[in-house]
């Protein structure tokens, strides 16, 4: 499995998106886990709602949230108030029974807040093409089931 780097700023939120094949993983709950060492186990941080149909509901564990757009095929994890100790290797997982398939390996890199004088050498301000609101977040559009919408699997 290839690894994707997501970089965020200490003290801010980082949004990680793990795309997947919605057909292949239809009906499966998802999870976010932290890899303990290169060959070690992956320690569960948070998983989607116990009822798969409610996977779009955001679930929190501490400062980490998870939500799943099961139709679009995007699992989104939010790490709130990112801290240096949040840096490291994670996995997005698809669960079936007691098994877990890796959807994506994610390397979270935490960087200093450019406006934090303790870390800043020369001050940096966002240019025209960057804003703090947008710059540190990978946006992904999630949609939940509308009232009365039947959750059929997508057709190819």
């Amino acid at each position: 499995h290839n690894t994707t780097v997501f970089q965020g700023v200490a003290g801010q939120s980082l949004q990680v998106s793990c795309p997947y094949d919605s057909m292949k993983h239809w009906g499966r709950r998802k999870a976010w886990c932290r890899q303990l060492g290169e060959k070690g186990p992956c320690q569960r941080v948070v998983s989607t709602h116990n009822l798969w149909l409610l996977s779009f509901l955001r679930r929190w564990n501490g400062s980490t949230a998870i939500t799943d757009d099961t139709l679009g095929g995007t699992l989104t994890i939010t790490l709130r108030n990112l801290q240096p100790h949040d840096a490291g290797l994670y996995q997005c997982q698809s669960l079936h029974g007691s098994e877990a398939d890796t959807l994506r390996k994610v390397l979270v890199e935490v960087l200093a807040d450019p406006l934090d004088h303790r870390d800043a050498g020369d001050l940096w301000f966002p240019g025209e093409s960057e804003s703090f609101e947008d710059a540190h977040v990978e946006h992904s559009i999630s949609r939940s089931l509308l009232e009365g919408e039947i959750p059929f699997p997508p057709t190819s």
């Epitope: 290839n2 690894t3 994707t4 780097v5 970089q7 700023v9 200490a10 998106s17 795309p19 240096p84 840096a87 390397l107 890199e109 935490v110 960087l111 200093a112 807040d113 450019p114 870390d119 800043a120 050498g121 020369d122 001050l123 940096w124 960057e130 710059a135 540190h136």
Partner: antibody, heavy 118, light 107 residues
Framework: EVQLQQSGPELVKPGTSVKMSCKAS????????IHWVKQKPGQGLEWIGY????????NYNEKFKGKATLTSDKSSSTAYMELSSLTSEDSAVYNC???????????WGQGTTLSVSS | DIQMTQSSSSFSVSLGDRVTITCKAS??????LAWYQQKPGNAPRLLIS???SLETGVPSRFSGSGSGKNYTLSITSLQTEDVATYYC?????????FGGGTNLEIK
Amino acid sequence: EVQLQQSGPELVKPGTSVKMSCKASGYSFPSFLIHWVKQKPGQGLEWIGYINPYSDGSNYNEKFKGKATLTSDKSSSTAYMELSSLTSEDSAVYNCARSSYRYGFDYWGQGTTLSVSS
Amino acid sequence: DIQMTQSSSSFSVSLGDRVTITCKASEDIYNRLAWYQQKPGNAPRLLISGATSLETGVPSRFSGSGSGKNYTLSITSLQTEDVATYYCQQSWSIPWTFGGGTNLEIK
């Protein structure tokens, strides 16, 4: 003004090591990853890896593991790359570059030319 | 590793032409694509990141489009200063990889 100033050209013998530097100015050094890119004369670009100056964590292209070692020094806002067991294949221009929050390399150093010859 | 394949390594164009350079990834890179311009003896210059976002100071004649595996860099009306080699680069999967480059030369 953001600048990445790289050390001068190097002419070294096969089997030796070299350490080149990339001094950043004009921005908060620990707030951006610093990457290293190799370019052989008349050829394309090859990503070596990056250093996170905030955490001192690094990440390498498998191809360069054991060849390149990336470090940084926050106090001097400088990133370093050491290349070991040099051969003629390592002769190239090496650039440092900063990656933006959209993951592109928005500022580049001028390059350090490495020549490995006996 | 994700392979990045650029349409052609070199092609001749005329000043004022609309130029389109394509880049195909071996798998979906979810818009984590950048375009660079490099002139002989110089470091590359970032033109576009996130597949479509034009960097500050880059002329508006440059634009980026695409999604999934297929991406395009367009120059609406080629100027003398645009004669260079153009590279695409993905940052979705480690190792980050570049296309082989497309060299524009004047007819």
